[in-house]
Structures are given as C-alpha cells and as structure tokens.
C-alpha cells in the first residue's frame, strides 16, 4: 500500500493528478464507523469542509483526498480530523513550465559516481493501476526504451549521462487524459573513492618552548569521511592534566576528501613535557600515518640544525 | 573479517550513567590497543572524535571533556571494550562506535546512539 503523506509542506505543480494520505489510515476498523472530515483553509476562508460537491476534481476515499487535477487556487492549508485525531499539511500549488517537459522547482537532485551503477526506474504506485503508458525523456527528449510501463535505465554511468530525465506517466480517469512527471537532475562526478590519507607537513618537527609558557601543536591532515585523527601522548605515565586535545576542525575539499586539523594544547609546560614525542596519528581501513612534535627548551635550540624546527 | 558491535546506548537524564559494551570478532583483540569514538549530531561529515583509549597494557587516556566522568577498559578474554559514562551531560549525546587505537582501523560498526536529555 502507498504510505502515508506524513511531510507537512507539500509543492506541487498545476495540472497534475495529486492526493493527499492521512496517516492513521492503518485504523480500518475504526474508520468505518467513525466520522471523518477533510477541512481546507486560505487567506480568506477559515476551515471549509470538503466534499465532492465542493468541486468536481476532488474525490474524497476512506484515507485519501484526490484532486483530479489539482489547480493555484488549491494552494492553502488542509486539514482531516477524525475522533480526536487531526493532521495537516500546507499545500503549495505552483505554476507549470509551458516551454519545458518539466518544472524546475519539482526537480530532485541525484549524484552518481562515474563508472558506479546508474538506475532510473519510471513507478508511480498509487496511480499504478490507471497508468495507459510511461514514458522517460532526457533532456526532453523522449528516449526509445523497450517497457512502455516502467521504462528502466541500468547502467554504469558515463559522464554523457548527466542529465534532466523526466519520467511522464500519463492515465485516464472519468475519460479524461492527465499526466504525472517526476524529473531527476543526475550529475556525473570523478570517481569518489578512497584516498590514503596523509598528514601534511614534515614527520619530525622540533618546536622551540620556554618552562611555565603554553604551546599549540597543530596537526593537519587530507583524509576520507570515515578517518579519525588524534593526538597519541602520555600512554605509559596515565593522562597529564595540562595537555588538552582541542576540537577537531573538517573543511570539505572540491573534490569531496576531507581536510582535518587537530590542535594538541600543553599549558604550563614543564621538564617531564621536554625531549618526549607526542604523535599525531591519522587512521584508516587502509593504514595509518603519523607525524611526531618534540619539544624543545629555547635554551637547547643551537643543538639542533636550523632546519627540522617548528615555530 | 572482523565485526565490531556496539551495545547498552539509550536515552538517559543529564546526571545519569550507562554503560557501552563493543565486541569484537575474528580478531586478535589483545595485542591491539582500542577506542571508543563519537559522532556529534552536527559533526560535519562523519568526524568522529576519539573520547577513551586503553592501550593492549591496560594504560587509559581521555578527551578533556569527559575526562573524571567516562571510563574505559577491556576484557581479552572476551574480546570486549566497556566504557563506562556516568554523570552523562547533554553534549555527550552521539552515535558512540569502538574501533582500534593507534593503528589501522577495523571497518566501522553500526555504533550506539546515546541521547542525554530531560
């Protein structure tokens, strides 16, 4: 059976077959002795009762209110009520594209990999048994497929593929012809797979510290979304409580990795905080990678070469 | 391969404790050292963020802010990791998931949610 409508804000676009499905529908045995009213209110009327008298493209069932179509003065609020159980929606009827196959507002937005496993399959299952015939377009173009019930796409995707496609079902009801469209806007992407994620910047780094002051060691790192960073320090002398590992930060990169940066705070620094590595460890399925800050007193700075210093 | 799961999540009152049980299958669970993750409902992405840590020696480590209230420890035997919360505040609430520390990681587990709320 078609579920329910549950979302509370609805578009639809003029002209069109639509329905609205409350969603205590499950309680048949109730339903049919119990009263039930479909009410509709806009700016200027408060809570009009329907019924098919109100209009001759609405048709009233157990669960569902049918427009057949429905039209811009249908936008407002709905409203069933049964016993004492009430469910509303604001229905927002939008104007149809005249010189398109489709409406852009009424677009949904897929992503496929290139290379990944590409489907579009034309299926409306409320309406399934008064669709004549579907058909699917790309582009507006209509595409010569072998089922004229469910046109179907499978395929790997090619970057040729992207693409509006438009799933048109068209059906008859109390002899007249409307159509139904679902349209996808499907873009092809490089492939997205996983990346060994790599710590940026030297695998040694001295930094230069003076006794009682704070430092802040910042470890960066490109990594994939399911990847972790922290901070490995004080496993064998139980936890210091002047060393602090700060919130990691995540910034997306365009090509969809993950840029990450961890901060290590040491406040107050001491003897026991000189001359022991503290290592910054990015992980994956894949591996890990690690990159180690020593520190070092101001003082001691002309015992090691200018270069493998981090300031 | 190996199978992580994650149980004993739940909605709990600020104040209140639980505790997170992850068993660990098909793996050589003693020599590795392991962590209990969480996932922040607006973490961007998946980041999750190590909170406890025990090495294969039994030597445990904390994030700052659970640090005194969450603790963390294992049982070889039956290749498991506990990590017990108690005096849990709103900020704790997230999907908690174990995984290795300080190695490869394992492929992830479904986790366990935590909600802390009144």
């Known amino acids: 059976a078609e579920s329910c409508t549950s979302r509370p804000h609805i578009t639809v676009v003029e002209g069109e077959p639509f329905y609205l499905k409350h969603c205590s529908c499950s309680l048949a045995h109730e339903i049919e002795t119990t009263t039930k009213s479909w009410y509709k209110s806009s700016g200027s009327q408060e809570h009009v009762e329907l019924n098919p008298r109100s209009s001759s493209r609405i048709a009233l069932h157990d669960c569902v209110l049918e427009f057949w179509p429905v039209e811009l003065n249908d936008t407002g609020s709905y409203f069933f009520q049964m016993k004492n159980y009430t469910q509303k929606w604001k229905l927002n009827v939008i104007r149809r594209n005249k010189h398109s196959c489709f409406t852009e507002r009424q677009v949904t937005s897929k992503i496929v990999e290139v290379k990944k496993f590409f489907q579009i399959t034309c299926e409306n299952s409320y309406y399934q048994t008064l669709v004549n015939s579907t058909s699917l377009y790309k582009n507006c173009k209509k595409l010569l497929l072998e089922n004229n019930k469910n046109p179907t796409i499978k395929k790997n995707a090619e970057f040729e593929d992207q693409g509006y496609y438009s799933c048109v079902h068209f059906l008859h009801h109390n002899g007249k012809l409307f159509n139904i469209t679902k349209t996808f806007n499907i873009t092809i992407v490089e492939d997205r797979s996983n990346i060994v994620p790599v710590l940026l910047g030297p695998k040694l780094n001295h930094v230069a510290v003076e006794l009682g002051k704070n430092v802040r060691l910042n470890c960066s790192a490109l990594l994939n979304e399911e990847d972790v960073i922290y901070w490995m320090f004080g496993e064998e002398n139980g936890s210091d409580p002047n060393i602090h590992e700060e919130k990691e930060m995540r910034i997306m990169t365009p090509e969809g990795k993950w840029h990450a940066s961890k901060v290590l705070r040491i406040e107050n620094i001491g003897e026991s905080n000189l001359n022991v590595l503290y290592n910054c460890t990015v992980a994956s399925t894949g591996g890990t990678d690690t990159k180690s800050f020593i520190l070092v007193r101001k003082a001691d700075m002309a015992d090691i070469p200018g270069h493998v210093f981090t300031r | 391969e190996v199978q992580l799961v994650e149980s004993g999540g739940g909605l709990v009152q600020p104040g209140g404790s639980l505790r997170l049980s992850c068993v660990a299958s098909?793996?050589?669970?003693?020599?590795?050292?392991m962590g209990w993750y969480r996932q922040a409902p607006q973490a961007p992405g998946k980041q999750r963020e190590l909170v406890a840590r025990i090495t294969s020696g039994g030597s445990t480590i904390y994030a700052t802010s659970v640090k005194g209230r969450f603790t963390i420890s294992r049982d070889n035997a039956k290749n498991t990791v506990y990590l017990q919360m108690d005096n849990l505040k709103p900020d704790d609430t997230a999907v908690y998931y174990c995984n290795i520390y300080g190695g490869a990681l394992w492929p992830w587990g479904q986790g366990t949610q935590v909600t802390v709320s009144s």
């Open positions: 098909g793996s050589i669970f003693s020599i590795n050292g």
